[in-house]
């Protein structure tokens, strides 16, 4: 903590400007009014303060707002956000998507820090659900965001938000997460026609039950092997050879290369050899 000293004559800062970069830490503490700093936070980000100087400015804001910063200050924190601890952020009430974007921008290109995770958690809890605009914003900054949520947290995602999800946002999701997301996606895309529906639902199919896979097999979807390999084993096992052939279309030949991997291996073992032979791929049950 910076020791309290009187501000030297003529050093009192009338505004937050670039000359403050030359102020020693004790001078910043003594000569910069905290209320002035709060009202001119938008200027701080344009001034190349050292990290130690930023510590002093943070300390001044902490003293001014012991219960947590108001959103008018939070929105303009800029690089000062990197100085905040998760404990600081838990005191905030962030409701504006613009504020969230401004702070995520500061951390852009870096891994999701504990500060960012806390900020997102506070924001989403404040909104009550992961609405489409929020999800759009979060996945734009952190493509893996959705898959970092627990199935319980994902259950608060409304089906309308699923439109914001891109295939790459689901790359790291496990089956438990897809089990939660798939029914929401099915609901969200239900009014689309066959081929368009399949394009949208494809990346969620790791959560699809057997009956939905059977229905898809009747629609000439030509599922690729990469998608097939991500299907739930328990959903694939009851499918007949004919259904898998229809589901994969021309991609059925790819089963041979995957015959030793799940779910293909387990599915092959469940089929009659006569049925497998109809594929002409040399699969051995």
């Amino acid at each position: 903590e910076v020791e309290k000293t009187a501000c030297p004559s003529g050093k009192k800062a009338p505004e937050i400007d670039e000359s403050l970069i030359f102020y020693k830490k004790w001078e910043l503490e003594a000569c910069v009014d905290a209320a002035l700093l709060a009202t001119q936070m938008d200027r701080v980000n344009a001034i190349p303060f050292t990290y130690e100087q930023l510590d002093v400015l943070k300390h001044k804001l902490d003293e001014l707002y012991p219960q947590g910063y108001p959103e008018s200050v939070i929105q303009h924190l800029g690089y000062l956000f990197l100085k905040m601890s998760p404990e600081d952020i838990r005191k905030w009430n962030v409701t504006s998507l613009e504020t969230l974007k401004a702070l995520l921008e500061v951390n852009k290109g870096h891994e999701m820090s504990p500060q960012v995770a806390t900020l997102i958690d506070r924001f989403v809890k404040g909104r009550g659900q992961l609405d489409k605009d929020t999800l759009d914003t979060l996945t734009a900054f952190y493509p893996g965001y959705l898959c970092s949520l627990s199935p319980e947290e994902l259950s608060s995602v409304p089906p309308s938000s699923i439109w914001a999800v891109r295939p790459q946002d689901l790359d790291t999701c496990d089956p438990r997460q897809l089990d939660v997301l798939y029914p929401k996606a099915r609901l969200a895309f239900q009014n689309m026609n066959g081929s368009e529906y399949f394009v949208k639902i494809q990346s969620f199919l790791g959560g699809a039950p057997t009956e939905d896979l059977k229905a898809l097999s009747q629609q000439n979807v030509s599922m690729d092997l990469a998608t097939f390999m991500k299907l739930r084993t328990d959903a694939v096992l009851p499918l007949t050879v004919a259904e898998v052939q229809k589901l994969l279309g021309p991609h059925v030949e790819g089963l041979k290369a995957e015959e030793r991997h799940r779910p293909v291996r387990d599915w092959i073992l469940r089929q009659r050899q006569d049925d497998l032979d109809t594929l002409g791929l040399g699969l051995q049950g």
Partner: nanobody, 127 residues
Framework: EVQVVESGGGLVQAGASLRLSCASS????????MAWFRQAPGKERELVAG???????YYSDSVKGRFTISRDNAKNTVYLQMDSLKFEDTAVYFC?????????????????????WGQGTQVTVSS
């Protein structure tokens, strides 16, 4: 790479004036800060005056009202006009330029923040 060269030092009587010049080359845009530091024998290097890329100025308490820092953009030169010189102003004066993108150091009054330094020019004030 920025090159910084000071000139204008010398021996003067107390109460007289001197103007130091600091010519920088090797870049087209202004550094974040240009500053004049001084170091008296047996003492630490201390900030005398600073100038930001936007033209804002800063002076240490000991020279405020007597020294003026300015620059001529066309000549890529920063000046330190020193009036009413005192015996205690005797020191080697260094010009420094800094960009410090990673923002380390305690503040821009700390010499550790500056990457580029001149070789120094001696100012001696006799009483």
């Amino acid at each position: 790479e920025v090159q910084v060269v000071e000139s204008g030092g010398g021996l003067v009587q107390a109460g007289a004036s001197l103007r130091l010049s600091c010519a920088s080359s090797g870049r087209t845009i202004s550094p974040i800060a240009m500053a004049w530091f001084r170091q008296a024998p047996g003492k630490e290097r201390e900030l005398v005056a600073g100038l930001t890329w936007t033209g804002r100025t800063y002076y240490s308490d000991s020279v405020k009202g007597r020294f003026t820092i300015s620059r001529d953009n066309a000549k890529n030169t920063v000046y330190l006009q020193m009036d009413s010189l005192k015996f205690e102003d005797t020191a080697v004066y260094f010009c420094a330029a800094g960009d410090n993108p990673d923002r380390r150091g305690s503040s821009w009054s700390s010499s550790s923040v500056y990457e580029y330094w001149g070789q120094g020019t001696q100012v001696t004030v006799s009483s």
